[in-house]
Amino acid sequence: SGTTNTVAAYNLTWKSTNFKTILEWEPKPINQVYTVQISTKSGDWKSKCFYTADTECDLTDEIVKDVKQTYLARVFSYPAGHVESTGSTEEPPYENSPEFTPYLETNLGQPTIQSFEQVGTKVNVTVQDEWTLVRRNDTFLSLRDVFGKDLIYTLYYWKSSSSGKKTAKTNTNEFLIDVDKGENYCFSVQAVIPSRRTANRKSTDSPVECMGHEKGESRETGHHHHHH
């Protein structure tokens, strides 16, 4: 069955980072357009991206309503220019997406080191808490608000003069590490959800930040550099 001269979508793929969630599919349309529907397992279908010639649809607004639900989407194909005249008795061809559970499957975005501060032989490294599009009432929630203690950060640090890396972990957004006096160190962090068992349990590493550059501050030297 299906509507004349339309091809069903295929390769439906969820692309999601920090809950920003886009459904992508193929093929690039030739004389056809698409409409996407999304639902939870127990809910009704909701249509989005009506009669679009794109091959992607931003479904963030839907999935952030409950990031712990499991969602299914489907993409309908319609002949371009004949959308309204499609016979109501004939269902257009469509393809289902894989199931998607945002809380378990959204990728962790690349974290950012907000600041570091040296006091004697201790350095406090702070990771910036990223905002998401998940809301509570009318307030946007941070990554930490959503994941809580499920989310940890791993810090990689090393002397600027050597390549031997050390690691530290925290379930907050701060590290307090011991360093050698008079040595400059470089830092990189990674977000991790240890309870995940798949490839998306870790983010990519943050950009490297090194002492002696703009991001930190040192009480030893009296130079204060604040990063905003």
Epitope: K68, L141, T172
Partner: antibody, heavy 120, light 113 residues
Framework: EVQLVQSGSELKKPGASVKVSCKAS????????IEWVKQRPGQGLEWMGD????????NYNENFKGRATFSADTSVSTAYLQISSLKAEDTAVYYC?????????????WGQGTLVTVSS | DIQMTQSPSSLSASVGDRVTITCKSS????????????LTWYQQKPGKAPKLLIY???TRESGVPSRFSGSGSGTDFTLTISSLQPEDFATYYC?????????FGQGTKLEIK
């Protein structure tokens, strides 16, 4: 409606094992931690640990490591607590609870509790 | 482990009274990332499971009456019942929901005077 329904009371002899079940309904079982809490008669609450059904990932209170085991069967949306080598001090009500929607937002839903009595 | 200490252990009060229960933690429960305090309050009545009242130190769980309020930051927290109702006589527990192992206070039993 979210519900956690626990198995019935158990009377066990010292040295035996017990397995308490917690059947969840009304929500996506795999995405919420199931917490286990012990309450001895007339005493306060003691967190035993938790399990995330999606991955089977667990956290244990050191006081219960070794004798308590958490498991979950996602096909029937049920979590289990098994305690081996039972002692008199294991006599208690055991609760399962579900974590809140937001991060670190408490135990939002609780089972009715299962009384385990250990007596010779 | 984070120790949670509640005071008083028991308290007698009358309907209509304003009641305050305090909870101290041995370490800060303030999350630097989002500036939230991961302190939770529960109410438990005899023979029943505990009920979540307050999370994030001051956020009321949906359906909890507005006479219950939570405050505090870092290591010092308070649960206040502005005007006691007959159904409020119960035992109240605070909980560290910040870091493993999660720990409860020993409880405060609120009795009718």
């Amino acid at each position: 409606e979210v519900q956690l329904v626990q198995s019935g009371s158990e009377l066990k002899k010292p040295g035996a094992s017990v397995k308490v079940s917690c059947k969840a309904s009304g929500y996506t079982f795999i995405t919420y931690w199931i917490e286990w809490v012990k309450q001895r008669p007339g005493q306060g609450l003691e967190w035993m640990g938790d399990i995330l059904p999606y991955s089977g990932s667990t956290n244990y209170n050191e006081n219960f490591k070794g004798r308590a085991t958490f498991s979950a069967d996602t096909s029937v949306s049920t979590a289990y607590l098994q305690i081996s080598s039972l002692k008199a001090e294991d006599t208690a009500v055991y609760y399962c609870a579900r974590s809140g929607y937001y991060g670190n937002s408490g135990f939002a839903y609780w089972g009715q509790g299962t009384l385990v009595t250990v007596s010779s | 482990d984070i120790q949670m200490t509640q005071s008083p252990s028991s308290l007698s009060a009358s309907v209509g009274d304003r009641v305050t229960i305090t909870c101290k933690s041995s370490q800060s429960l303030l999350s630097s990332g989002n500036q939230k305090n991961y302190l939770t309050w529960y109410q438990q009545k005899p023979g029943k499971a505990p009920k979540l009242l307050i999370y994030w130190a001051s956020t009321r769980e949906s359906g909890v009456p507005s006479r219950f309020s939570g405050s505090g930051s870092g290591t010092d927290f308070t649960l206040t019942i502005s005007s006691l109702q007959p159904e409020d006589f119960a035992t109240y527990y605070c909980q560290n929901d910040y870091t493993y192992p999660l720990t409860f206070g020993q409880g405060t039993k609120l009795e009718i005077k």
